[in-house]
Interface confidence: medium
């Protein structure tokens, strides 16, 4: 015999108290798959969290963070304060990137500058705390008599991660 609950679509639950009728999920709850015997409680985006996507009968709410904070963890399980570009967040607060590293966002860690020589290229623009180095043509390409080299386009300003 087929389980009658298998006919209950997402957004409903199989109500054992009502002869296994498919009942709509109550307010502030959802079921994202069919055949559910209960609906799950919607996530509430409170405090430093804000609602990115409202809960519906078939999908949970999604949160991000209020201004000045950004998400951490799967599904934005935590919010932490923004730092400035050129910094990273440590246990002692936001700290400037060490020489040789950069961070072009208000979140995340400082990363080492690109080592242009590993690709046989030269440094065209020096790196800063906020920006990676820009690698140029290889030193051989710049030797006298070499064919002219079209300078690379300016590096695109990187966008911030979604907040």
């Amino acid at each position: 015999l087929q389980d009658p609950c298998s006919n209950c679509p997402a957004g409903t639950f199989c109500d054992n108290n009502r002869n296994q009728i498919c009942s709509p999920c109550p307010p502030n709850s959802f079921s994202s798959a069919g055949g559910q015997r209960t609906c799950d409680i919607c996530r509430q985006c409170k405090g430093v969290f804000r609602t990115r996507k409202e809960c519906s009968s078939t999908s949970n709410a999604e949160c991000d963070c209020t201004p000045g904070f950004h998400c951490l963890g799967a599904g934005c399980s935590m919010c932490e304060q923004d730092c400035k570009q050129g910094q990273e967040l440590t246990k002692k607060g936001c700290k400037d990137c060490c020489f040789g590293t950069f961070n072009d966002q208000k979140r995340g860690i400082c990363r080492p500058w690109t080592n242009c020589s590993l690709d046989g290229k030269s440094v065209l623009v020096n790196g800063t705390k906020e920006r990676d180095v820009v690698c140029g043509p290889s030193p051989a390409d710049l030797s006298p008599g070499a064919s002219s080299v079209t300078p690379p386009a300016p590096a695109r300003e990187p966008g911030h991660s979604p907040q």
Epitope: K46, G47, V48, R50, G68, K84, L89, G93, C94
Partner: antibody, heavy 118, light 107 residues
Framework: QVQLQESGPGLVKPSETLSLTCTVS????????VHWVRQPPGKGLEWLGV???????DYNPSLKSRVTISKDTSKNQFSLKLSSVTAADTAVYYC????????????WGQGTLVTVSS | DIQMTQSPSSLSASVGDRVTVTCRAS??????VAWYQQKPGKAPKALIY???YRDSGVPSRFSGSGSGTDFTLTISSVQPEDFATYYC?????????FGGGTKLEIK
């Protein structure tokens, strides 16, 4: 306990720059942001901007070209500068701490009245 | 900018009355609303954040509710020290904005 205290000149001439200092105690500057809010006499509250623990700033776009917020961690001080002031900038100016729980203000200074007049 | 419209702008009440102040946002702000109390000549004091969470030390007679665009601050039994002006504030997006205030006066 947590304390914030605003200080600065009570009278500023039109077209000059208003400069205020907020001296704080009782909490760590590496963990908390500080907002500046003003209140013209007999009117409501207006948010000016915030400086976060790492030094990043966010400003009210209506004032963005005129306002600068900075901090000196070694002195436990925050500063507000508002350039090209007019009589409309006459107000009580408050600094207030941002908690770790939301983008709000949980502790406020007592406020300082700044009058713009020649 | 998100406009926060408070009503009424003033109201009179007696000690022991139940009082409700409302705040309407011009667009959905989730539950990212705070309430402040301000007495004459004093700085504002935080009462509620996240629409319904009382700040530490705030008496239980103060409660907040609402989500989306409509929010309320309720004082279940007004005490003499509650006569003040109350402001709502949204922090869902920049710029942070306040309501125009509601002045609670003694009847």
């Amino acid at each position: 306990q947590v304390q914030l205290q605003e200080s600065g000149p009570g009278l500023v001439k039109p077209s000059e720059t208003l400069s205020l200092t907020c001296t704080v105690s009782g909490f760590s500057l590496i963990s908390y942001g500080v907002h500046w809010v003003r209140q013209p006499p007999g009117k409501g509250l207006e948010w000016l901007g915030v400086i976060w623990s790492g030094g990043s700033t966010d400003y009210n776009p209506s004032l963005k070209s005129r306002v600068t917020i900075s901090k000196d961690t070694s002195k436990n001080q925050f500063s507000l500068k508002l350039s090209s002031v007019t009589a409309a900038d006459t107000a009580v100016y408050y600094c207030a701490r941002n908690p770790l729980t939301a983008t709000v203000m949980d502790y406020w200074g007592q406020g300082t009245l700044v009058t713009v007049s020649s | 900018d998100i406009q926060m419209t408070q009503s009424p702008s003033s109201l009179s009440a007696s000690v022991g009355d139940r009082v409700t102040v409302t705040c309407r946002a011009s667009q959905n702000v989730g539950t990212n609303v705070a309430w402040y109390q301000q007495k004459p000549g004093k700085a504002p004091k935080a009462l509620i954040y996240s629409a319904s969470y009382r700040d530490s030390g705030v008496p239980s007679r103060f409660s907040g509710s609402g989500s989306g665009t409509d929010f309320t601050l309720t004082i279940s039994s007004v005490q003499p020290e509650d006569f003040a002006t109350y402001y709502c504030q949204q922090y869902n997006s920049y710029p942070l904005t306040f309501g125009g205030g509601t002045k609670l006066e003694i009847k």
